[in-house]
Interface confidence: low
Amino acid sequence: EEELQVIQPDKSVLVAAGETATLRCTATSLIPVGPIQWFRGAGPGRELIYNQKEGHFPRVTTVSDLTKRNNMDFSIRIGNITPADAGTYYCVKFRKGSPDDVEFKSGAGTELSVRAKPSAPVVSGPAARATPQHTVSFTCESHGFSPRDITLKWFKNGNELSDFQTNVDPVGESVSYSIHSTAKVVLTREDVHSQVICEVAHVTLQGDPLRGTANLSETIRVPPTLEVTQQPVRAENQVNVTCQVRKFYPQRLQLTWLENGNVSRTETASTVTENKDGTYNWMSWLLVNVSAHRDDVKLTCQVEHDGQPAVSKSHDLKVSAHPKEQGSNTAAENTGSNER
């Protein structure tokens, strides 16, 4: 009779993480008598996966009933596969011996490759807000995928970005891999509603890539523009001066009126109006009693936006020596000065 051969018909098996791997093995003869063992790897450091004779292997089940006397099918199933299970598995026949069984013949081995999906990409932006025309960096990370081949793209509002750098780690062989990418984005005044998207495509994601997003509203600061104007008022001795605060983001803003350098009133932006681009407008007004002033009055609208240094805009009220001539048309003149 021919000597027993251990046949592992599959050189390689490809399994998705979480699935069950079937490793096939048959013997060509019932003799010599003795158990089968499965190992991962070869040599002295090999790892025991299944022992027909003894032991507890909760993730392993046999394909056929190994207690049957005439059984020659020693295939096993390993459940809930993870990338850590990748490797070459050997089906080894032992000959019954005393006191220990002796290794008789090994199969050629089956390489188990595990396909694992990347984790959802996490996009993070800069810690501090930046103003339009500045370049900011976003990072994107995804982990736990296998094989190593992966594609990462960056988009801003659907437009693909080209200024980014990507690394896949580790460089050598590993059970699973991680990707890290940094993209540079130039901010514009219209970016409050913008989104940066990191898109990861992998062989395990045939249907759709995974996406991570970051809203530029969390990154951008659009400083306000100020305009101080004088409004006509019916009352002869009163002038209404308004400060228009336009196109700012985020909403956090405090405004202070100064009369000749002295604080007249401070208020916080509350009932703002929102522009289409996501920025805000706000208006504050000051009623000035001209008859209470003997000299010209310098009115300053000072705005502190989102904790930044204050910006201001001033307006000069000319106080005439003849109160009756102080109509709304002649009472003031806007100098248009813009001070910091």
Epitope: L14, A16, E19, G158, A201, T204, Q206, G207, D208
Partner: antibody, heavy 123, light 107 residues
Framework: QIQLVQSGSELKKPGASVKVSCRAR????????MNWVRQAPGQGLEWMGF????????TYAQGFKGRFVFSLDTSVSTAYLQIGSLKAEDTAVYYC????????????????WGQGTLVTVSS | DIQMTQSPSSLSASVGDRVTITCRAS??????LAWYQQKPGKSPKALIF???YRYIGVPSRFSGSGSGTDFTLTISNLQPEDFATYYC?????????FGQGTKLEIK
């Protein structure tokens, strides 16, 4: 030459089930996702969903959850569509169509289609 | 779901004509749009992907344009074999959706 070859027409009674096959020729089945598209008589095209041919993971469109099952046998390069508890309104031509898979340049466009399988449900 | 609306539903033309079929998406699909041709009793055939690119073997008289929500398929110098039903399809968002079709008939 790339081809998707589907099984022949089927006549079934209401309540029965049917299994339509789609064999990939000229390319490796597991390199492309396989979609299923329904076309009722005289009607337009309706996407039923797809199966990830690498992992065997199916994704079903909203109206096709429950009675419809996508499966694979990679050893014979074949994708399957099984419909259970057939109804008269399931009468249609069923197409398999491949897509490149994840968003590539032509992402979810169906570049090759099977010839279609007519499933008629009638008592 | 993204609705795809084609117009017209049908049109008649003669050999040698130039025809335009439009497809409107209910929301922005970028350039993730394809066009297909289907003849009676046959499976659809892919013509255009990514809104503007012809598949290999598709004659140059077929051209696509558009992005966002509005797209067109233009067939210049109509040939007898071009009379068929044409479908647009978006693949920007799941579920993938098709237009209702435009039937091009001989005048």
């Amino acid at each position: 030459q790339i081809q998707l070859v589907q099984s022949g027409s089927e006549l079934k009674k209401p309540g029965a089930s049917v299994k339509v096959s789609c064999r990939a020729r000229g390319y490796t089945l597991t390199d492309y996702a396989m979609n299923w598209v329904r076309q009722a008589p005289g009607q337009g095209l309706e996407w039923m969903g797809f199966i990830n041919t690498y992992t065997g993971e199916p994704t079903y469109a909203q109206g096709f959850k429950g009675r419809f099952v996508f499966s694979l046998d990679t050893s014979v390069s074949t994708a399957y569509l099984q419909i259970g508890s057939l109804k008269a309104e399931d009468t249609a031509v069923y197409y398999c169509a491949r897509t490149r898979g994840y968003y590539d340049f032509d992402g979810g466009a169906f570049d090759y289609w099977g010839q279609g399988t007519l499933v008629t449900v009638s008592s | 779901d993204i609705q795809m609306t084609q117009s017209p539903s049908s049109l008649s033309a003669s050999v040698g004509d130039r025809v335009t079929i439009t497809c409107r998406a209910s929301q922005n699909v970028g350039t993730h749009l394809a066009w297909y041709q289907q003849k009676p009793g046959k499976s659809p055939k892919a013509l255009i992907f990514s809104a503007i690119y012809r598949y290999i073997g598709v004659p140059s008289r077929f051209s696509g344009s558009g992005s966002g929500t509005d797209f067109t398929l233009t067939i210049s110098n109509l040939q007898p074999e071009d009379f068929a039903t044409y479908y647009c399809q978006q693949y920007n968002t799941y579920p993938l959706t098709f237009g209702q079709g435009t039937k091009l008939e001989i005048k």
